[in-house]
Each structure stands twice: as structure tokens, then as C-alpha cells.
Amino acid sequence: EEELQVIQPEKSVSVAAGESATLNCTATSLIPVGPIQWFRGVGPGRELIYHQKEGHFPRVTPVSDPTKRNNMDFSIRISNITPADAGTYYCVKFRKGSPDVELKSGAGTELSVRAKPSAPVVSGPAVRATAEHTVSFTCESHGFSPRDITLKWFKNGNELSDFQTNVDPAGKSVSYSIRSTARVVLTRRDVHSQVICEVAHVTLQGDPLRGTANLSEAIRVPPFLEFTQQSMRADNQVNVTCQVMKFYPQRLQLTWLENGNVSRTEMASALPENKDGTYNWTSWLLVNVSAHRDDVKLTCQVEHDGQPAVNKSFSVKVSAHPKEQGSNTAAENTGTNERGSSDYKDDDDKHHHHHH
């Protein structure tokens, strides 16, 4: 009789995770009598996958009924494949004995498992940054196989080029992970912007997975401050407003100081949003001019999103002549948007009326 050969026709088989894998094996002879065993790997550490004669292998079923007369088909089907099942499988013929004696092995079939990447998770910087600064976003996806994968970054639909990507591990593995870091330059208009990480893989049939992050979580837009003053009212009161403009996020505290003393503190809440996602807020202060003998220095102090306070100062000039009271006040917007305060005195003639 011809010498027994164990034939594994496929060198490799690729299966999607969750599916069943069929590993084919046939013997060319009924002789010698003895069982087939399937192993993953070779050598002393090889893993027994199926033993025709004995054992319990719940995920493995023989393709052909082992009790079928003259059976020479020793193919098996492994159900519910996971990436951990990847490896090279060997169909090995044993000669009946006590114990059975290994006789001949097939050439092996490499099982590769196609596993989908997990949904990409995009994380932004831990602390907010202001316009013109560069922030980093990280995208991670795990558990995919094979190793080949494509990752792209987009900001508002425009592809980004400043990013670095790593796929781990570098060597062979049952599954892989990808991590990519993109650098994004912020602008004041980015409150409504979004970054997208897009992952394409053979298992996704051309329908890439996307992870997103909103730049609103990463950006801080500091406010502009402006003073306005209405003319003297009949009751010797002047209405001064501090306009806080184009800021994000909403978290903001405004303090009025009269001659350095805290007059009122307010917290911004439930503000309407501008089109660009920023907020405006106007706070007003009524200054009773008749209660002051000297000029009143008003300061609008804004603390935005836990940052150092921004001050804007304003002088309300009070006339020394009682007969002119009620009409001889002047106020001048002398502040700047810089942190700290600036106070510029008006000219020395306190009798002049300055209307700005």
C-alpha cells in the first residue's frame, strides 16, 4: 500500500472574529489505523485542539462523521473564532497503540483572524488653551487584526497632516492597537469646531469608524472688555456699563470696584450664545455722583474660567462746584484689556465736562 500522507490543502485561512473556521485535512490511506489529533503550534508546548479518540472539545466539531466507514477526512470546524485563536494548526496522524504513536503531520494551516477595531476614542488636552496655541488630540482603537490599518484626522471636514501614529505591538500578535496624536492650532472661531479621527480596516468593508472630539472642550476664548457711560441723570446718578465680549466658556465672574472697594460681584449664567459659540455679557453700575467729593475710579474686574483677573478701569470726574452739581460730571474710559489695571487721569481742569 501507498505510504500515508497527511494533506492540509490550505496554507492559510482567514476568518472574521465570531465566525467559524474550517481547517481541512485528509489522509491518503486508511493505514495505519489510529486517531488524528489537531494541534496549534509545534514542539513540546503545542496546544491540543482536537483529539479524535478522547477528550471534550466543545468548540470543535469534525466536518466528517468520524464513525463514517473508511473515513479519511479529518477536517475540523472551530466555532466562535476570536483573535486568540490565531496561529498555525497541524493535523497529526497517530498509530494506534498504548499510548498512540505520532506518525505524520500535515504541513500546517495558518489561521488568521480578522477582528474589527474598537470604536476610536478621541481625547483632548487636560487643560484649555487659547487661540493661536497648539493642542494635542489622541485617538485610540484596539483589538483589530490583521495589523494593516489606516487612520486619518479631520478638523471641520478638512484633513489634517500634523499627526503621529503608532501601531502596537511591532511584532506578530493576535490583535493590535493603534494610537495617534494630532496637533491642532486653535483659532478664536473654534468653539464650534470638531476634530474627527477616522479608522479604516479590511474588516469594515469600506465603512470607516469615526471618533470625534469637540474643540469646545479644549479652547478658551478670553473676553474683550469695554466701558460705556450714559449721561448724568436728574437724580445725580451715572449709569456705567462694562461689556464683556466674545468669551468662552461661560464660566465668568465680574466684580465692580469703586475706588478699589468691592461694590458688587456677579456670576455669568444662562447667557445666550453668539453664532460662533462665544458669549457676551453686559453688567451695569449706577454711580451716585453726589455722594462723592472726588473723582470716582471704577474698575470692572473679570475673572474668566479660573484665569488671572482682567481689569478695565474708568474715571468718573466729580465737579468741586456745588452749583454745577448734576451736570458737571465727566467719565473717561481709561482702561485696557491687559491683566492688572491701568488708570489714566483726565486733564487737570476739573471744571471741564468730558463726554465720551
Epitope: L30, K53, K96
Partner: antibody, heavy 119, light 110 residues
Framework: QVQLVQSGAEVKKPGASVKVSCKAS????????INWVRQAPGQGLEWIAM????????HYNQIFKDRATLTTDTSTSTAYMELRSLRSDDTAVYYC????????????WGRGTLVTVSS | DIVLTQSPDSLAVSLGERATINCRAS??????????IFWYQQKPGQPPKLLIY???NLDSGVPDRFSGSGSGTDFTLTISSLQAEDVAVYYC????????FGQGTKLEIK
């Protein structure tokens, strides 16, 4: 290693039935045929029937088709052979044997169960 | 059904001598290139033991003084050098169709 342990000797009256058991161990019971063979005192071997425990497919020797029934209990890896309407010439040692190569041969044998039919 | 006829019914051979037992089938037991003949040895008070499968293949643990040959309808079991422990009854069996046994050959020492 493969072992087939058979039930003990039986004495039966003509017309009665006997059920002989064969408990298998050392291998996957459902992967191999079980044969039943008998041997009358001083006589040769006579094949009765065979059963596939995986699906209870059976093949019978025509001589025994009407009187013998083979069954298995896969939960206990036990095969049974029942012979009905016993006659005195059914007195024999009844063997179970496992077919290891699916060649319809008998690779491993039980030690036999003596069934004596006598009035 | 295939009928197997063994010859001789009994045989006496001197220790160390060759013993030959024949088995003839009423029709060919060959299929797909294999000859479906098996040989068994049965010692007193013991179950039979498989010696040869598919006409010429020694079962595991069987001494190599035993051999099988033949094809089609005529088959032979040979013991090249008889040992005392070889005293037994020898049966051929076919499985080209459903199993049947030959009537057996009793081997004794001369």
C-alpha cells in the same frame, strides 16, 4: 487506555429477554462503533450487530434482526444489547467490541458476558 | 452475504516452525484498493485479539512473526516461527460488507 467493562453472567428461561451492558472508558464513546459478537460453547465467533453511539445508526446480522436491539446511553458511555425470545441455543458468551478504525473491525473487546438459557 | 472458509480446521506445528492458515472468501473482499480482511487470535477463556487489519497490516503490539497476505478472495495468516504462546484459535473476518467470521482454525504445537 480503552476499556470495555461488561455486565455479569445471566441465567434466563427460554422465551425470556436478556439485556447485556458494556461500559466504555478511555476514549470518546460517540466517535467509534460498538459491535456485539457471540460465541456458543466450543463454537466460533458470530457477529450480531453494530451501533454508532453518535446517532444510534445500527446494522444487524439478518439472523438477529427481529430479536436483537442495540442501544446506547451517551451520558454514561454505555452500550446495551437486548436479545428477546431466548432459546437454549442462545446460550453463549456475548462480547462487545469497539471498532477503532471505522473499518467494521473489532479492535478492543470486552471480557464477555455468559448468558445461559435453561429451563 | 460473503462466506469465509478457513483451512485447515486445525493445525499442529512444531515450535520454531512456520504456521500457515488460509481464508477464502466467497467473493472479493477488495474495495478502493484495500482488502477488508482481519485476523484474530483467541486463547482459551479470553476474548479475541486483533492481529492483522486490512489483510496485511500488523496491529499495534503484535509480534512481527505474524504477517498477513493475499488479495481479492484468498488470504493467508503466517506465523514465521511458532512460539508456545501462539497456541490459540485463529479467525479471519471480512468487512467488505457487514462483518462475518470464518469458522476458525485451531493451532496446536506438534
Amino acid at each position: 487506555q480503552v476499556q470495555l467493562v461488561q455486565s455479569g453472567a445471566e441465567v434466563k428461561k427460554p422465551g425470556a429477554s436478556v439485556k447485556v451492558s458494556c461500559k466504555a472508558s478511555g476514549y470518546t464513546f460517540t466517535n467509534y462503533w460498538i459491535n456485539w459478537v457471540r460465541q456458543a460453547p466450543g463454537q466460533g465467533l458470530e457477529w450480531i450487530a453494530m451501533i454508532d453511539p453518535s446517532d444510534s445508526e445500527t446494522h444487524y446480522n439478518q439472523i438477529f434482526k427481529d430479536r436483537a436491539t442495540l442501544t446506547t446511553d451517551t451520558s454514561t458511555s454505555t452500550a446495551y444489547m437486548e436479545l428477546r425470545s431466548l432459546r437454549s441455543d442462545d446460550t453463549a458468551v456475548y462480547y462487545c467490541a469497539m471498532d477503532y478504525g471505522s473499518l467494521y473491525a473489532m479492535d478492543y473487546w470486552g471480557r464477555g458476558t455468559l448468558v445461559t438459557v435453561s429451563s | 452475504d460473503i462466506v469465509l472458509t478457513q483451512s485447515p480446521d486445525s493445525l499442529a506445528v512444531s515450535l520454531g516452525e512456520r504456521a500457515t492458515i488460509n481464508c477464502r472468501a466467497s467473493k472479493s473482499v477488495s474495495s478502493s484498493g484495500y482488502n477488508y480482511i482481519f485476523w484474530y487470535q483467541q486463547k482459551p477463556g479470553q476474548p479475541p485479539k486483533l492481529l492483522i487489519y486490512l489483510a496485511s497490516n500488523l496491529d499495534s503490539g503484535v509480534p512481527d512473526r505474524f504477517s498477513g497476505s493475499g488479495s481479492g478472495t484468498d488470504f493467508t495468516l503466517t506465523i514465521s516461527s511458532l512460539q508456545a504462546e501462539d497456541v490459540a484459535v485463529y479467525y479471519c473476518q471480512e468487512s467488505r460488507e457487514l462483518p462475518t467470521f470464518g469458522q476458525g482454525t485451531k493451532l496446536e504445537i506438534k
